[in-house]
Interface confidence: low
């Protein structure tokens, strides 16, 4: 139609100018479009330079929209992480503060002369929670061994107790149970509780990190072309106000975000595992009950030692022989009063319940984040036509969009009519993030069963599913050798990656 040749390019001028480009590039009226590389080659209001500028701009706009969506998710995960982390640290700090306030009065020198040992225990629990390479059972075993030596000496200042005698005491300890049931109970409960808490918080961190890294994955050149065609070619071809057909938009974005959609299965597995592990936050072995009550187990242990002192001493003498009397030493220490025990069950504050119910709801909301991205971006960012009618932009003209909508993920894009996707070349960054999701899910599943994946016994038969390379700490491949209870090293062992100062500090 000759009349269309002289059609004004006013609408394109407005859009192009609003994008910050120079209006001197825009033709006054339509020109022949043989020069176009992306848009259909009819009469057009776009020069080659305009087409290139708009292609770059549409690419940048999609990347920005993608980053915006990711940022919202990242912010949610980071907020969750901070809330849970604050709560768990608060529980442990509360327990330590209670201990520091009550133990001097309850146990006198039995506590004050060993305050450093207790402080170090809390430091190590804190470090373990934060992800440090230490074996919680080892840490607790060493703590009790050191404490027994020190308290036994204090309870018998009239005796000379050389190292070899203390070695013998240490060897007898397991059978004698000098601290009663408290060490065993604390070990069983603390291991489960700390493993659950730390793996849940790590899960939030890994999820957030995956989103951050995937948001940085650049969109390929084929995607650029397809998005240009989707968003701006209608303007170049003088089809004013034609909004993209919904299925057309979905196909473009499913092609552009094919690799991202491949995160879906492992992302769901991770979030499911995180929701599942919150079950371990309740009950007598639950996070709140145990982490906030460490001091009560410690009090119970010292009480048990005092109650059993005479029997214990007799059995130790029976097994290790009569120790020499210390001529300078005072008489045997008077039996102390029992330290009053706080109720072991912390009444739930309600804070954790609120945090967990919010987290569960939010994690469920974002389960289909990766596969719903094309739909989300199409509806929110593209101002789509409301119906698949004959009036929407289908990439060539106004009219119905006929091709079917592709499935999700890379493999399903083999016949995508809008974006040429090489399904044999998955994005390396995204593959790496899929592996990280697998590793973290593996940790959470182990944690659900009360195991720290970094310390699976060498005696395990190795059966069961797993991600192969699923270890994030160097201790995965190495079981720490149990220090014999006779080696009198300081309670703070050198923790890799932490200065001595940091290893000893308390909040």
């Amino acid at each position: 139609d000759p009349a269309s040749k002289s059609r004004s390019c006013g609408e394109v001028r407005q859009i192009y100018g609003a994008k910050g480009f120079s209006l001197s590039d825009v033709p006054q009226a339509e020109i022949s479009g043989e020069h176009l590389r992306i848009c259909p080659q009819g009469y057009t209001c776009c020069t080659s330079e305009m087409e290139e500028n708009l292609a770059n701009r549409s690419h940048a706009e999609l990347e920005t929209a993608l980053r915006d969506s990711s940022r919202v998710l990242q912010a949610m995960l980071a907020t969750q992480l901070r809330s849970f982390d604050d709560h768990f640290q608060h529980l442990l700090n509360d327990s330590e503060r209670t201990l520091q306030a009550t133990f001097p009065g309850a146990f006198g020198e039995l506590y004050t002369q060993n305050a450093r040992a207790f402080r170090d225990l809390y430091s190590e629990l804190r470090l373990y929670y934060r992800g440090a390479n230490l074996h919680l059972e080892e840490t607790l075993a060493e703590f009790w061994a050191r404490l027994l030596e020190r308290l036994f000496k204090q309870l018998h200042p009239q005796l000379l107790l050389p190292d070899d005698y203390l070695d013998c005491l240490g060897k007898q300890a397991e059978a004698l149970r000098p601290f009663g049931e408290a060490p065993r109970e604390l070990r069983l409960r603390a291991t489960r509780a700390f493993v659950a808490a730390r793996s849940f918080v790590q899960g939030l961190g890994v999820a957030s990190d995956v989103v951050r890294k995937v948001a940085q994955v650049p969109l390929g050149p084929e995607c650029s072309r397809a998005v240009m065609k989707l968003v701006y070619c209608a303007h170049c071809l003088g089809v004013p106000g034609a909004r993209p057909c919904p299925d057309y938009c979905r196909n473009v974005l499913k092609g552009c975000l094919a690799n991202q959609a491949d995160l879906d299965a492992e992302w769901r597995n991770l979030l499911d595992s995180m929701v599942l592990i919150t079950d371990k936050f309740w009950g007598t072995s639950g996070v709140e009950s145990v982490i906030g009550s460490v001091h009560t187990w410690l009090a119970e242990a010292i009480n048990a030692l005092q109650d059993n002192r005479d029997t214990l001493t007799a059995k130790v003498i029976q097994g290790c022989g009569n120790p020499k009397v210390n001529p300078q030493g005072p008489g045997p220490e008077e039996k102390r009063r029992r330290g009053k025990l706080a109720p072991r069950e912390r009444p739930p504050s309600g804070t954790l319940e609120k945090l967990v119910s919010e987290a569960k709801a939010q994690l469920r909301d974002v389960q289909d984040f990766w596969i719903s991205l094309p739909g989300t971006l199409c509806s929110e960012k593209m101002a789509l036509s409301t119906a698949s009618d004959d009036r929407c932009w289908n990439g060539m003209a106004r009219g119905r969009y006929l091709p079917e909508v592709m499935g999700d993920g890379l493999a399903n894009q083999i016949n995508n009519p809008e974006v040429e996707v090489d399904i044999t070349k998955p994005d390396m960054t995204i593959r790496q993030q899929i592996m990280q999701l697998k590793i973290m899910t593996n940790r959470l599943r182990s944690a659900y069963n009360g195991n720290d994946v970094d310390f699976q016994d060498a005696s395990d038969d190795g059966s069961g599913s797993g991600s192969g390379d699923g270890c994030l700490d160097d201790l995965c491949s190495r079981k720490v050798s149990r220090k014999s209870s006779s080696s009198r090293t300081p309670l703070t062992h050198a923790l890799p990656g932490l200065s001595e100062q940091e290893g000893q500090k308390t909040s």
Epitope: G131, G205, D474, G497
Partner: antibody, heavy 130, light 102 residues
């Protein structure tokens, strides 16, 4: 420009301890995982230790596991390697190296475990155990 | 350790490929001109090239094998090339090195 300067090498006595320091500049040190890699005379590269940006994740190569401690001071932009109970086979050039990508998330520990993503190396410091 | 050929040779201006296998998902390639001199990263994370490295160096992976390709080989490319990755216990490892003779 990124620079990594190692120091602390020289002639060492078997059975004693060694402390190497790497001073970094030209990048935001606290955002990057760091490594120590060594090379025995006439041999290939060997992973010694890695440390993530927070200092929590610290994997060690099998030859030094149990004898080495890697630590970092983000304020001073330094990473330190302490190697105890030195042996003749610890002789070689020790290089400080940097992970390619910054980590701003709270848990980037996995970066300390791979030798696939190093983008900068120091000139090395020579250690002779004799 | 990672498996890579002990040596490869190339003609000036030709193309050469060095392979590496036995590691995890990602590989790095490090060039060392002489023993004791600092390595230089030519490829990291399998495919990324630092900005100061010429475009004739490229990396790719297929399955569990990584390949360093140098197109238009120059005399200055003569060196030992080490690959790096991680092992099954997720700790860093390097290959024994491949000597490129031009």
């Amino acid at each position: 420009a990124v620079t990594l300067d190692e120091s602390g090498g020289g002639l060492q006595t078997p059975g004693r301890a060694l402390s190497l320091v790497c001073k970094a500049s030209g990048f935001t040190f606290s955002s990057y995982t760091m490594f120590w890699v060594r090379q025995a005379p006439g041999k290939g590269l060997e992973f010694v230790a890695g440390i993530d940006n927070t200092g929590i994740y610290t994997p060690y190569g099998s030859a030094v596991k149990g004898r080495a401690t890697i630590s970092r001071d983000n304020g001073q932009s330094t990473v330190r390697l302490q190697l105890n109970n030195l042996r003749a086979e610890d002789t070689g050039t020790y290089y400080c190296a940097k992970y390619a990508d910054a980590c701003t998330g709270p848990w980037c520990g996995s970066s300390a475990y791979t030798a696939s993503t190093i983008d900068a190396w120091g000139h090395g410091t020579e250690v002779i155990v004799s | 350790a990672l498996t890579q050929p002990a040596s490869v040779s190339a003609n000036l201006g030709g193309t050469v490929e060095i392979t590496c296998s036995g590691g995890g998902n990602d590989y790095g390639w490090y060039q060392q001109k002489s023993p004791g001199s600092a390595p230089v990263t030519v490829i990291y994370d399998s495919i990324n090239r630092p900005s100061n490295i010429p475009s004739r160096f490229s990396g790719s992976t297929s399955g569990s094998t990584a390949t360093l390709t140098i197109t238009g080989v120059q005399a200055d490319d003569e060196a030992v090339y080490f690959c790096g990755s991680y092992d099954s216990s997720y700790v860093g490892i390097f290959g024994a090195g491949t000597t490129l003779t031009v």
